[in-house]
């Protein structure tokens, strides 16, 4: 009986460990500033790091600029987007800016894209100041299915702060779907 | 056999409970405004409450102004920082302000400090308005090792809102490191 | 013994599944713009969706404009509030605005209300720009007891962005109370 009990304990520890790790996908992706689009309109950001510095990914996939869900579940999604301008970068085309982020979900099965979260601000970045900065943070709890894709759209991408501590997004699984 | 089964069940419940609680350190620290530095430069905030009001800590340590990790894992870190100024407080030295927060990680083993997250905004707080307010929120998912320390740096600390609902930071463990 | 072991495994899987789901209440509530109060003063927002679009709730209750906790635990709470104004909506009563959010907790047993988190900004929305936008995000980790209620207060509710991706709040349980 003792041997059986040990076997039960062992298999349970094994199962608990395995299920726990399998049940918790996550990603933290940081901006890759080598390929930021020009323009001031809303664009999808496709270049992100997933394996350097603070960037990491597990049980999710990063492909074609999108974070792909591999495991059904409820996830907490977040994004932090920083914009900055220094007068040495040149004159802004307009001092009235819409600095926005949109966190979108795309379903391959039903080809459609929907905005899960948005944030931002209109700003007046006048020439009276040599430096301007603004950050946006959004976060929320969403049901995601395997195969669904998360992407980030921003306005004025050329104003993005390229630091890994400034412009990033991520997700972590909190619980299974019943 | 029944006795053995009960023993297995009992030990398992015990183990599950124990491992679950041990696996989930957390902290929510609120600003201690009795000791906020003056000046407008970037400073590390060292005075935080950990055991009054909304402030709490478990399986983490607060020491010398830093939140110390006791258990390896992936944590969600967050900070909310509020700045405010009322004309009754006197005139601002400058109306052009950089209101910023930096969440930093320090490793004792390799004495180095790195910024995990930053946020904020440049603001023009003109004398035309009697009251000014601005809040920053940042959050992200990071791998932390036992002994590493989390601290908060801000610009213009004398403008911090001292309320516990306004200026705080925290962390909670989401999962183990594989 | 094998039959007993299977029974132990079976009951354990059942228990683990059940306890896991019971242990993780959550809610993501999106603004119901059909009933937003007018005025610029601070008001409690009572109309939220809990079962359409991104809105969802499990093991928590939404009643009388409040999110009610059904299960003791430590929860991560968050809110995202967007304000906007277009010149076609008419002239603002004042160009100097306080755009604020307050996440409050009410205890029925001891009839009292406390602010857990606040955020926002004073803004100068001048007539020089045809469109204005601003978003606030707050989040934090709190101990909540069964029966306690979470509600959202904002200033200038008539300026709220009614989109489900813009104005929402939520919570998810992270761990039990020891």
């Amino acid at each position: 009986i003792r041997a059986e009990k040990a076997m039960v304990d062992g298999s349970w520890l094994d199962l608990a460990k395995r299920s726990k790790l399998e049940a918790q996908p996550f990603a933290h992706l940081t901006i890759n500033a080598t390929d930021i689009p020009s323009g001031s309109h809303k664009v999808s950001l496709s270049s992100w790091y997933h394996d350097r510095g603070w960037a990491k990914i597990s049980n999710m996939t990063f492909s074609n600029g999108k974070l792909i869900v591999n495991q059904d579940g409820f996830y907490y999604l977040y994004a932090n987007i920083c914009f900055r301008h220094h007068e040495t970068s040149g004159d802004l085309a307009t001092e009235y800016l819409q600095l926005m982020v949109y966190v979108t979900k795309t379903s391959i099965k039903i080809p459609s894209s929907h905005t899960l979260m948005k944030g931002g601000s209109t700003k007046y970045w006048s020439g009276n100041s040599e430096f301007h900065f603004y950050s946006i943070n959004v976060g929320g709890f969403f049901k995601l299915r395997s195969g669904e894709e998360i992407s980030i759209e921003v306005s004025n991408p050329s104003l993005l702060d390229p630091d890994q501590d400034a412009t990033y997004f991520g997700a972590f699984k909190v619980r299974d779907i019943d | 056999i029944r006795a053995e089964k009960a023993m297995v069940d009992g030990s398992w419940l015990d183990l599950a409970k124990r491992s679950k609680l041990e696996a989930q350190p957390f902290a929510h620290l609120t600003i201690n405004a009795t000791d906020i530095p003056s000046g407008s430069h970037k400073v590390s905030l060292s005075s935080w409450y950990h055991d009054r009001g909304w402030a709490k800590i478990s399986n983490m340590t607060f020491s010398n102004g830093k939140l110390i990790v006791n258990q390896d894992g992936f944590y969600y870190l967050y900070a909310n920082i509020c700045f405010r100024h009322h004309e009754t407080s006197g005139d601002l030295a400058t109306e052009y302000l950089q209101l910023m927060v930096y969440v930093t990680k320090t490793s004792i083993k390799i004495p180095s400090s790195h910024t995990l997250m930053k946020g904020g905004s440049t603001k023009y707080w003109s004398g035309n308005s009697e009251f000014h307010f601005y809040s920053i929120n940042v959050g992200g998912f990071f791998k932390l090792r036992s002994g590493e320390e989390i601290s908060i740096e801000v610009s213009n600390p004398s403008l911090l809102d001292p309320d516990q609902d306004a200026t705080y930071f925290g962390a909670f463990k989401v999962r183990d490191i594989d | 013994i094998r039959a007993e072991k299977a029974m132990v495994d079976g009951s354990w899987l059942d228990l683990a599944k059940r306890s896991k789901l019971e242990a993780q209440p959550f809610a993501h509530l999106t603004i119901n713009a059909t009933d937003i109060p007018s005025g610029s003063h601070k008001v409690s927002l009572s109309s939220w969706y809990h079962d359409r679009g991104w809105a969802k709730i499990s093991n928590m209750t939404f009643s009388n404009g409040k999110l009610i906790v059904n299960q003791d635990g430590f929860y991560y709470l968050y809110a995202n509030i967007c304000f906007r104004h277009h010149e076609t909506s008419g002239d603002l009563a004042t160009e100097y605005l306080q755009l604020m959010v307050y996440v409050t907790k009410t205890s029925i047993k001891i009839p009292s209300s406390h602010t857990l988190m606040k955020g926002g900004s004073t803004k100068y929305w001048s007539g020089n720009s045809e469109f204005h936008f601003y978003s606030i995000n707050v989040g934090g980790f709190f101990k909540l007891r069964s029966g306690e209620e979470i509600s959202i207060e904002v200033s200038n509710p008539s300026l709220l962005d009614p989109d489900q991706d813009a104005t929402y709040f939520g919570a998810f349980k992270v761990r039990d109370i020891d």
Partner: antibody, heavy 122, light 107 residues
Framework: QVQLVQSGGGVVQPGRSLRLSCAAS????????MHWVRQAPGMGLEWVAV????????YYADSVKGRFTISRDNSKNTLFLQMNSLRAEDTALYYC????????WGYGMDVWGQGTTVTVSS | AIQMTQSPSTLSASVGDRVTITCRAS???SSWLAWYQLKPGKAPKL??????SLESGVPSRFGGSGSGTEFTLTISSLQPDDFATYYC?????????FGQGTKVEIK
């Protein structure tokens, strides 16, 4: 593909008006500033006017200030140049051109129209 | 206003030659300088922006350099398709100024 198609040129008497149009396709027109540049017969290129992506900011060469007006309709992806009080020295081949950067001035003009001729003569 | 002076006005060269065109500003300027190629009956083509950045799709034989008051466009090995007129263009404080042009012709 990315292109700018111009129209509206012609022969006009001094003192009269003319409106040039530039229809954009293949890119997000509302995200970029737009220029008008001209080349008088046998001469070099001369910058005329620019408008920011949102239409808020407009700048003009001294030679046309007060007479020419640049505008845009982002819903129709079209740029305009309204030329009033035309003079003989305004005779030129007029080009519309897209700003390389939507956010900053100064990066140059990366897409050009085919040009349209304006002749001011009595 | 800042004046931009190109030299030479005309340049005779052969295929394979290394060609350098200079653009001088009347006072020290930022690096907001672009170079264009213009052929008869065609629209101008952007070659270089911000003094030294090569526009996408432009052959690598074209290069830009310089700062202060003197900027240069270099064609490392002249090709038959490169015979055209080249213009520098400077941006400063909401004003755009073109040089008078340099015509590169066959020797």
């Amino acid at each position: 593909q990315v292109q700018l198609v111009q129209s509206g040129g012609g022969v006009v008497q001094p003192g009269r008006s003319l409106r040039l149009s530039c229809a954009a396709s293949g890119f997000t027109f509302s995200g970029y500033g737009m220029h008008w540049v001209r080349q008088a017969p046998g001469m070099g290129l001369e910058w005329v006017a620019v408008i920011s992506y949102d239409g808020i900011n407009k700048y003009y060469a001294d030679s046309v200030k007060g007479r020419f007006t640049i505008s845009r309709d982002n819903s129709k992806n079209t740029l305009f140049l309204q030329m009033n009080s035309l003079r003989a020295e305004d005779t030129a081949l007029y080009y519309c051109a897209k700003c390389l950067s939507g956010t900053y001035w100064g990066y140059g003009m990366d897409v050009w129209g085919q040009g349209t001729t304006v002749t001011v003569s009595s | 206003a800042i004046q931009m002076t190109q030299s030479p006005s005309t340049l005779s060269a052969s295929v394979g030659d290394r060609v350098t065109i200079t653009c001088r500003a009347s006072q020290s300027i930022s690096s907001w300088l672009a170079w264009y190629q213009l052929k008869p009956g065609k629209a101008p083509k952007l070659l270089i922006y911000k003094a030294s950045s090569l526009e996408s799709g432009v052959p690598s034989r074209f290069g830009g350099s310089g700062s202060g008051t003197e900027f240069t466009l270099t064609i490392s090995s002249l090709q038959p398709d490169d015979f055209a007129t080249y213009y520098c263009q400077h941006y400063n404080s909401y004003s755009w100024t073109f040089g008078q042009g340099t015509k590169v012709e066959i020797k």
